[in-house]
């Protein structure tokens, strides 16, 4: 690696992957092992992130970019840049301080993460429950009760295609 120096603005001359060494008359020196600088003109390099324990390496550290981590199977990322790993639960459960717990009646969770959410209240939209909710699935709302009078179909057929100048049959 060629150590470089600029007379006018020594540090701005140092590219990513190097640091501008105050102690060496501001020459550009390569980042030491397990460190990186993602921008030019840095006085020091930063220490590479280490993906340990429940974290696993998604992208290795290089002299110009930090390592990126994700989570081992059974865990999922939380926070910016996967700063934390949280335990997965099954669908129909949520993570509490005491571990994974089933969703209470009237709530559901269709993912391995997050909290149990209340079933949709179909009546608020003037609709009825078409399919009951479970711990893993939300209710499915159908047409309003008035639409379900005798003889009425619970599924509305598609409207026939109309051409300009023709009234519906």
């Amino acid at each position: 690696f060629e150590r470089t120096r600029s007379l006018q603005d020594p540090c701005s001359n140092c590219p990513a992957g190097t640091f501008c060494d105050n102690n060496r008359n501001q020459i550009c020196s390569p980042c030491p092992p397990n460190s990186f600088s993602s921008a030019g003109g840095q006085r020091t390099c930063d220490i590479c992130r280490q993906c340990k324990g429940v974290f696993r390496t998604r992208k290795e550290c290089s002299s110009t970019s930090n390592a990126e981590c994700d989570c081992t199977p059974g865990f999922h990322c939380l926070g910016a840049g996967c700063s934390m790993c949280e335990q997965d639960c099954k669908q129909g459960q949520e993570l509490t301080k005491k571990g994974c717990k089933d969703c209470c009646f009237g709530t559901f969770n269709d993912q391995k993460r997050g909290i149990c959410r209340p079933w949709t209240n179909c009546s608020l939209d003037g609709k009825s429950v078409l399919v009951n909710g479970t711990k893993e699935r939300d209710v499915v709302c159908g047409p309003s009760p008035a639409d379900l009078s005798p003889g009425a179909s619970s599924v509305t057929p598609p409207a026939p295609a109309r051409e300009p100048g023709h009234s519906p049959q």
Epitope: N22, N23, P32, S35, R43, T44, C45, I47
Partner: antibody, heavy 123, light 107 residues
Framework: QVQLQQPGAELVRPGASVKLSCKAS????????INWVKQRPGQGLEWIGN????????NYNQKFKDKATLTVDKSSNTVYMQLNSPTSEDSAVYYC????????????????WGQGTSVTVSS | DIQMTQTTSALSASLGDRVTIGCRAS??????LYWYQQKPDGTVKLLIY???RLHSGVPSRFSGSGSGTDYSLTIRNLEQEDVATYFC?????????FGGGTKLEIK
Amino acid sequence: QVQLQQPGAELVRPGASVKLSCKASGYTFTSYWINWVKQRPGQGLEWIGNIYPSDSYTNYNQKFKDKATLTVDKSSNTVYMQLNSPTSEDSAVYYCTRNGVEGYPHYYAMEYWGQGTSVTVSS
Amino acid sequence: DIQMTQTTSALSASLGDRVTIGCRASQDLSNHLYWYQQKPDGTVKLLIYYTSRLHSGVPSRFSGSGSGTDYSLTIRNLEQEDVATYFCQQGYTLPYTFGGGTKLEIK
């Protein structure tokens, strides 16, 4: 563990140069910068200069360019600072310190400090 | 040379208090700011490096923050052993320079 050993006190005659020592242990001596810092009684801290033991590269604060001379003895893991033509203004505690690892975020921080040598310039 | 200013030269606080000590630089330091603790017996220790990173062995009651020219050291749950003088130092460019120090006492 990292240690920087300095003598507790030195009494110096005005005009008679004195050489302060700083013996390092507990780490790879040649791989870290050693600084010298001055503190007058009841005052703040002043950086005098530093030296890299591996190749004896030095930097000096312009204010101390003619006052201090930094040298190293690799065989004994010791750094020296000679105070030239001392006057009463040079009566102070002198600390040697060690920088962090080259290139890392704490590189220019003084990670470890000696106990300091109290220098009294008096006839 | 970069001038480092600690406007408060002395402050007094009670045990358990939260204390903040400020430091201002005459130019942008790009976070190359360090904090030291000097005990009454003269012993000096590095507390914080690169603005906010805790040096090994330093209690988590100490924290640092700031950017550009303005930086601060915060001590939570003040303890008797925190009685000391606190100095900031810039490592942005030579010569390294220190603030004048802030002497912390217990009420």
